[in-house]
């Protein structure tokens, strides 16, 4: 997954006893929050693995790359990064692995340059629909976000609200149409069983979509048609059994796409014939020669590209009276 990177190494570390003396005041130009390391040359602040329970209030105004990883933030309230003067330069924000379970509406407001946001590896039981849009208007001001990294944000089963996790995430992605400029979206390792059908149509600028290591069984109701400039579609390590004609045609119609399909339990029966034909002709699938059948048992480990129509049969459906349980 992507994350902000720093290009210089001259970090200054502040002493813990300076912690809150000036936290309510505007930060001095060279000030570094307690428990953080700062490099003005690299415009980078790192507050990493420090068990912080809230976002430091005295972040330096120059910060462009902010790492707040490996902390214990729990809740990201509205305006968590709102400062006077604002953090106008902040472009890349990494909050991964900080035990966030709630991100509230407007958490990222007043960050006019925020292009990269990584919330991965947080058990987000409560992601507000307005976490990224900042308001509940039907059309919000466009978010500056270009990359949104949400890998492994699924909470444990017992901590989920009584609603679809997929639905909660999608609501946040679509609210106010704020993310129309999003180019990279990573949603890997989230136990997604399905992809809500409206999500992709409303993210027309997507270039990279990572849905790997989920539990997607089918793409039948998903349309990629609006993603005219999609460049990578990662579907590795899901539960896909077959891709049907409609999906194949849509993917083939995207001139810049590369599709990644490794490690899915492909079912090599009569329904697989169209996909096999397509695989033999297409150039869009990366490593297509590695795709193998998982079912039925007699076809296990057969290479899809080596199959022909005679290999792909379906057992006749028995009338109910002849079926055994």
């Amino acid at each position: 997954s992507s994350s902000p990177t720093s290009s210089a190494s001259s970090f200054s570390s502040s002493a813990p006893f300076l912690a809150s003396a000036v936290s309510a005041q505007p930060p001095l130009p060279d000030q570094c929050p307690a428990l953080c390391e700062c490099s003005e040359a690299a415009r980078t602040v790192k507050c990493v693995n420090r068990n912080l329970t809230e976002v430091p209030t005295d972040l330096p105004a120059y910060v462009r790359n902010l790492f707040l990883t490996g902390n214990q933030l729990a809740v990201l309230p509205a305006g968590a990064f709102a400062r006077r003067p604002p953090l106008a330069e902040l472009a890349a924000l990494n909050l991964s692995g900080s035990r966030l379970d709630e991100v509230r509406a407007g958490a990222f407001e007043h960050l006019p340059s925020l292009r990269q946001l990584d919330l991965s590896h947080n058990p987000l039981a409560d992601l507000s629909p307005f976490a990224f849009s900042g308001s509940n208007a039907s059309v919000s001001a466009p978010s500056p976000l270009v990359e949104l990294i949400l890998n492994h944000i699924v909470p444990p089963e017992d901590e989920r609200q009584n609603r679809s996790f997929e639905g909660m995430v999608v609501a946040a992605l679509l609210a106010g149409r704020a993310l129309q400029g999003l180019r990279r979206l990573e949603l890997a390792s989230n136990h997604f069983l399905y992809l809500p059908r409206d999500v992709l149509a409303q993210l027309p600028s997507l270039r990279h979509l990572d849905l790997s290591n989920n539990s997607l069984v089918s793409l039948t109701y998903v349309s990629f048609r609006n993603l005219t400039h999609l460049e990578s579609l990662h579907l590795e390590d899901n539960a896909l059994k077959v891709l049907h004609n409609g999906t194949l045609a849509e993917l083939q119609g995207l001139p810049h796409i590369r599709v990644f399909l490794d490690n899915n339990p492909w079912v090599c029966d009569c329904h697989m014939a169209d996909m096999v034909t397509w695989l033999k002709e297409t150039e869009v699938v990366q490593g297509k020669d590695r795709l193998t059948c998982a079912y039925p048992e007699k076809m296990r480990n057969r290479v899809l590209l080596e199959l022909n129509s005679a290999d792909l049969d379906c057992d006749p459906i028995l009338p109910p009276s002849l079926q055994t349980s």
Partner: antibody, heavy 115, light 107 residues
Amino acid sequence: QVQLVQSGAEVKKPGASVKVSCKASGYAFSSSWMNWVRQAPGQGLEWMGRIYREDGHTNYNGKFKGRVTMTADKSITTAYMELSRLRSDDTAVYYCANGGAMDYWGQGTLVTVSS
Amino acid sequence: DIQMTQSPSSLSASVGDRVTITCRASQDISNYLNWYQQKPGKAPKLLIYYTSRLHSGVPSRFSGSGSGTDYTFTISSLQPEDIATYFCQQDNTLPWTFGGGTKVEIK
């Protein structure tokens, strides 16, 4: 903003090869596709091919098949275009262009083929 | 290969004029049509992609329209800095191909 910086001008003899480099910065938001386009003096633009930098997959214009090789080194965010068996009509400015729709272009590299 | 026919090859207009350039593809290109601006001695710059989408930072006086095989590029009010050559390009079917260019001058 994505920036592409190309290697300097080259003078080559017919039959020789040339290798042009293109270094990308502002990389976080750049595309995986790097295209190569050339422009002969006073002429239009001609697409030569493209490389998908993540896995090295290439598409070449049939006109250059067998003479052009595109490679990429992810570790240094640099793409390369090598054209072999040069002829005088290969004299042109060679551009790298990042993106499916060629969103960002390098400054160009003039390759002169002359005996 | 898909042929892209651009017209006119050159035009002269006054500052403030509306300028229109057309591009015709030899077959349907499903809106995968881009427009570039090139000034002398410089690299081309993307202005419009996918027929009508404005590339970031491009002034709103530039626009595009069309479908199927016929596409149009418009400068709503020509400015002195718009003096350049404009190219169309299709990225629907490999190999990508360009139009021959339209040189825009000030009267």
